[in-house]
């Protein structure tokens, strides 16, 4: 059962895994659900009557029964981790610490004119797990100004202490803030020979590299796969980091394969969410349960709906044998991770689900698409929304993405004439404009959040987000997309699609179905030359042919520009301007998603 | 509620600068755009220019080099000031604000009356 | 810049009847876009401009129906269908397409 709350001076006796340091309750509850382990938790906040050694002290706790007896205790905080809750779950913790000193190996020491630059700086360096900055009012004047990087192997303070004009806080790599490139290649026959902080077992390299991901000292890995020569080491996944944060030395090794972390990737590919079977694999591990079970199918469910298993091994039914069922081995260990990984004995192995909840929804699988054809299939666009106007008589306005679950994200122009967010009706998980009816179900707008520097489509900034008065369900039908990573600047994509229900031709009507285009993107200089009257800056993307004939046109303006890269469909570009509609040698203008990440995140992010 | 109300002299002498100010209430002048507009009497209404909620201006080619625009978002007031007026000049003088976008004109201040005049 | 040229320049009609007031730009309207940034403003004796119409045909909230917008790139057109007698004043188009905006030269109303 999910439980949020905190529980005041209570704490939790016993079921000790181990201690670490957190600047709040509220943090000690994350760390805890990011524990292979961890379901509950007891925190100690400062208190004169407590020692301060122990002030900050966040002890990481197991049970069986998934519970532990209570005991009052002044300035104990205490709590249940997240797994237990169906709810997303983020990392990201943008909290500043005023007069703490969070302690950890001070790396990199420099000048910064504020505390926000110095989180910057840490959320940019590959190392840096959190900071503590001497503020202008701080006695000692050599250290007034001083921004301190700091790493420790947890990714948590080795110790808490109170210090007076400090300020402390955490990378923001986790919000999808850092600048840092997203390395997605996975290099095979590749060994990288650098130190080794960990190793774990893991089926493929895949899952190795989403191992090194949410581990905190990891930047890169090596995997050796289930060939390598030497048996003792298949399936050994090693977790590396190097003083430069990139491999020094990369050496040519048969059926081994080698890849980064996926730190500045992670709000766009799954890096929790271990959801592939491993056929004739047994993963070996601490036993939780054996349960009769259908298929490997439902072992996995069985798996995801029991909190304390990490992963498990389905060995198929004898013929017959027990009405069609087979044993379901549900299995735990220290790391989440398999102690061992064996081949050959018949077994169907697989991870729990529950941590899929970590992971962005946008980076869910969606149905295989009907390629060709103009029109869409239902569920194929399922981040698409149409916005609508109620004034003065309903009808559809614009288009738009679907990117948290109370946040749409389109174009400013959308809402020339609209004085206010009560006419706007967002109707999600719709193919044809006609099934809205006057009883079809839609999300009311509480606010409309225009970028401040908008001011024509032609001049840029052409961006807005419509906030929600309910949240969105997310169903097959209506999903949200992933923002591009700021980390994937320099990706080309290939598989480029607008989507909408606008105009057709320039002189006709909105289109009753959802129509699909696919668009290659065309580049900003490229671009400069097709619109030589017009500044298509960087804050743009072009897509179309040479030979036009394939556009945006009105009506589809504040829709997807989706490119689906790796897997995973990303929201590249907002339908923004254009000189006609798919003319010769004149490209559509969208919005440029990836330089306003920064900017969406802080106005979706805001308490 | 939203309410506009231009103030200044009703008076002013040819050659002289115009300062007229229009205080705003109900919004904030970082959320919504400003524009100023004036009507000489028994004629036709003439845009002069905006302050754009990001603090940027822009004017009317005819008047650009006559006119600035600023605001001291504080006091939720934008200021017109005209070089060189000219009997010509006469005029209401009316701020406007536009809804979401820069337009349309949703709401008007009542307009004021400035006679140039030696 | 661009010029509105409104025609006619005044004209008076019995109420009930229909009213019509054209609004040709030197320049098409139409923004790259896909709006149409053509507004039409009425101003009653004494009183300042008040918004009918934005982008070209969509009537502002509490404007009567009688009142309708048309017209694409250059040409619009103003429709009141049955005048009445509160309709007096005068009718002024507005572009805000292109920097700097302009309005036309104004259309007055009277009413026989």
């Known amino acids: 059962e999910c439980v949020t709350q905190l529980l005041k001076d209570t704490c939790f006796e016993g079921g000790d895994i181990t201690t670490v340091f957190t600047p709040s309750a509220k943090y000690c509850q994350v760390v805890c659900t990011y524990h292979p382990r961890c379901l509950l938790f007891t925190f100690t906040a400062e208190s004169p009557s407590e020692d301060p050694t122990r002030w900050f002290t966040c002890v990481l706790k197991d049970s069986v029964t998934e519970t532990l007896p209570r005991v009052n205790r002044t300035a104990a905080i205490s709590g249940y981790s997240f797994k237990q809750c169906s709810h997303q779950i983020s990392a990201c913790n943008k909290d500043i610490y005023v007069d703490l000193d969070m302690k950890g190996i001070n790396y990199n020491s420099s000048v910064a004119k504020s505390a926000q630059e110095c989180q910057e700086r840490c959320t940019d360096d590959v190392h840096c797990h959190f900071f503590t900055y001497a503020t202008r009012q701080f006695p000692s004047l050599e250290h007034r100004n001083i921004c301190l990087l700091k790493h420790t192997q947890t990714g948590t303070p080795t110790r808490i202490t109170k210090l007076d004009k400090v300020v402390s806080g955490f990378s923001l790599k986790s919000c999808a803030l850092s600048n840092l490139a997203c390395i997605r290649d996975i290099f095979p026959n590749t060994v990288f020979a650098d130190s080794n902080i960990d190793s774990v077992m893991a089926p493929d390299a895949f899952v190795c590299g989403r191992i090194c991901t949410h581990h905190p000292g990891c930047l890169f890995f090596t995997f050796f796969s289930q060939e390598w020569p030497k048996e003792s080491q298949r399936n050994l996944c090693l977790l590396k980091t190097s003083e430069s944060g990139l491999p020094s030395t990369r050496i040519k090794k048969s059926k081994a394969l080698s890849g980064f972390s996926l730190q500045s990737c992670r709000h766009s590919i799954p890096v929790f969410c271990h959801s592939s079977f491993y056929h004739d694999t047994d993963f070996l591990g601490e036993e939780l349960d054996i349960v009769a079970a259908k298929s490997h199918e439902a072992c996995q469910k069985l798996c995801t709906n029991a909190v304390r298993c990490q992963f498990f091994t389905y060995t198929p039914a004898q013929a017959s044998c027990n009405e069609g069922k087979g044993k379901c081995y549900l299995k735990l260990s220290s790391n989440g991770s398999p102690t061992k990984i064996l081949h050959g004995r018949g077994g169907i192995s697989g991870y729990t689900l529950r941590l899929c909840k970590m992971d962005n929804e946008c980076t869910t699988k969606i149905k295989p698409r009907i390629v060709g054809g103009t029109a869409s299939v239902r569920g194929e666009w399922p981040w698409q929304v149409t916005l609508h106007t109620t004034s003065p008589t309903q009808r559809h306005l614009c288009g738009g993405s679907i990117i948290g679950n109370q946040w749409i994200l389109t174009a400013a122009h959308c809402f020339y004439g609209v004085e206010s967010p009560k006419i706007l009706r967002v109707y999600s998980g719709i193919l044809n404009q006609s099934e809205i009816k006057e009883d079809t179900s839609f999300f009311g707008v509480q606010e409309i959040i225009i970028h401040d520097q908008y001011k024509m489509a032609e001049s840029g900034y052409d961006i807005a987000l419509l906030k929600l008065e309910t949240t969105v369900n997310y169903t097959d039908s209506q999903r949200p997309i992933c923002l591009p990573s700021k980390g994937d600047r320099n990706v080309i994509y290939t598989d480029c699609w607008v989507t909408g229900w606008g105009y057709r031709k320039l002189r006709d009507k909105i289109q009753n179905t959802l129509q699909k285009a696919k668009i290659p993107l065309v580049t900003n200089e490229e671009c400069q030359k097709r619109y030589r009257g017009h500044k298509i800056t960087h804050k743009m993307i072009c897509a179309g042919y040479r030979e036009g004939g394939k556009d945006a046109c009105k009506g589809d303006s504040g829709g997807p520009l989706s490119c689906k890269h790796n897997e995973v469909w990303h929201l590249v570009g907002i339908t923004s301007w254009g000189e006609g509609c798919a003319q010769r040698e004149r490209p559509g203008v969208y919005t440029n998603v990836v330089e306003y990440v920064d900017w969406i995140l802080e106005k979706t992010q805001a308490v | 509620q939203v309410t506009l109300k231009e103030s200044g002299p009703v008076l002013v002498k040819p050659t002289e600068t115009l300062t007229l100010t229009c205080t705003v209430s109900?919004?904030?002048?970082?959320?919504?755009?400003l524009h100023w507009i004036r009507q000489p009497p028994g004629k036709a209404l003439e845009w002069m220019g905006l302050?754009?909620?990001?603090?940027?201006?822009s004017y009317n080619s005819r008047l650009k080099s006559r006119l600035t625009i600023s605001r001291d978002t504080s006091k939720s007031q934008v200021v017109l000031t005209m070089t060189n007026m000219d009997p010509v000049d006469t005029a209401t003088y009316y701020c406007?604000?536009?809804?979401?976008?820069?337009?349309?004109?949703?709401?008007w201040g009542q307009g004021t009356l400035v006679t140039v005049s030696s | 810049d661009v010029v509105l040229t409104q025609t006619p320049l005044s004209l008076s009609v019995t109420p009930g009847q229909p009213a019509s007031i054209s609004c040709r730009s030197s320049?098409?309207?139409?923004?790259?876009?896909?709006?149409?940034?053509l507004e039409w403003y009425l101003q009653k004796p004494g009183q300042s401009p008040q918004l009918l119409i934005y982008?070209?045909?969509n009537r502002f909230s509490g404007v009567p129906d009688r009142f309708s917008g048309s017209g694409s790139g250059t040409d619009f057109t103003l429709k009141i269908s049955r005048v009445e007698a509160e309709d007096l004043g005068v009718y002024y188009c507005?572009?805000?397409?292109?920097?700097?905006?302009?309005f036309g030269q104004g259309t007055k109303l009277e009413i026989k």
């Open positions: 982008g070209v045909s």
């Open positions: 109900g919004f904030s002048l970082t959320s919504y755009h």
């Open positions: 320049q098409s309207l139409e923004s790259s876009d896909g709006n149409t940034y």
């Open positions: 302050m754009w909620r990001d603090g940027d201006t």
């Open positions: 507005f572009q805000a397409t292109r920097d700097p905006f302009t």
């Open positions: 406007a604000r536009g809804m979401t976008l820069a337009t349309p004109f949703l709401y």
